[in-house]
Amino acid sequence: LVPHLGDREKRDSVCPQGKYIHPQNNSICCTKCHKGTYLYNDCPGPGQDTDCRECESGSFTASENHLRHCLSCSKCRKEMGQVEISSCTVDRDTVCGCRKNQYRHYWSENLFQCFNCSLCLNGTVHLSCQEKQNTVCTCHAGFFLRENECVSCSNCKKSLECTKLCLPQIENVKGTEDSGTT
């Protein structure tokens, strides 16, 4: 099966790489604009230059194109704890990230929030905090992992999953009580 091509892809595929078909005259292939620029006017004829203009401040194009307008620069979402890693240039969008000792949690494909990396109190670091993943903790004896925090087994209710993790501790306590001197 041949994949369905959109009108723009169909038009572009007629021309060699780096060129696009003139929208008013399909016998003319115009050179695409470099990244950092946009299409101001199509080339007037074969072998003639396409009129490309540089993107204005606050906009960009990251690849060769024949866009009539540059794309607006993204803004980092301060309300989600995001900070600017690198500012927008004519050929590259803003790069947003998190502060040191924080990680990104993606709520959806293009929306992330910054959270502090877990410190693994009452446990040890099993896997260090990474750009897109919180620290993975292993808890000390007498503690169990709940939502990536080491919680005392004294907070373990019988109905919860922690009973399995805290059972050895409970048995140890029993054992200590049973092994009293006569």
């Epitope: 301060k78 309300e79 959270f115 502090n116 990536n148």
Partner: nanobody, 119 residues
Framework: EVQLLESGGGLVQPGGSLRLSCAAS????????MIWVRQAPGKGLEWVSY????????YYADSVKGRFTISRDNSKNTLYLQMNSLRAEDTAVYYC????????????WGQGTLVTVSS
């Protein structure tokens, strides 16, 4: 005790409108970014929109951009979602929540309000 009570859902025809409300209590409403999420039948949670504490910064999922408008009234501790040009794919249970701060989990949910878009 934190409480979030959604209302305003119902059956509407494609192209129609609805306005959802979320009455909040038990926390300092005007200190939190508030969000709307939805869950379509048999699907996972999808972020719809959020609004910052002052009502100046908003976010919309691409699927609702230009059709839905989020707003809030801090004097009434109420969050709103105006839904226009509704489509069948907007059918879902809509929930409001406060944006978590310490960890990526929602500690409090309302019961949700069902929006059904059908002719």
């Amino acid at each position: 005790e934190v409480q979030l009570l959604e209302s305003g859902g119902g059956l509407v025809q494609p192209g129609g409108s609805l306005r959802l409300s979320c009455a909040a209590s038990g926390f300092t409403f005007n200190a939190y970014t508030m969000i709307w999420v939805r869950q379509a039948p048999g699907k996972g949670l999808e972020w719809v929109s959020y609004i910052d504490p002052h009502g100046t910064i908003t976010y919309y999922a691409d699927s609702v951009k230009g059709r839905f408008t989020i707003s809030r009234d801090n004097s009434k501790n109420t969050l709103y979602l105006q839904m226009n040009s509704l489509r069948a794919e907007d059918t879902a249970v809509y929930y409001c929540a406060k944006l978590p701060r310490a960890a990526p989990r929602f500690d409090y949910w309302g019961q949700g309000t069902l929006v059904t878009v059908s002719s």
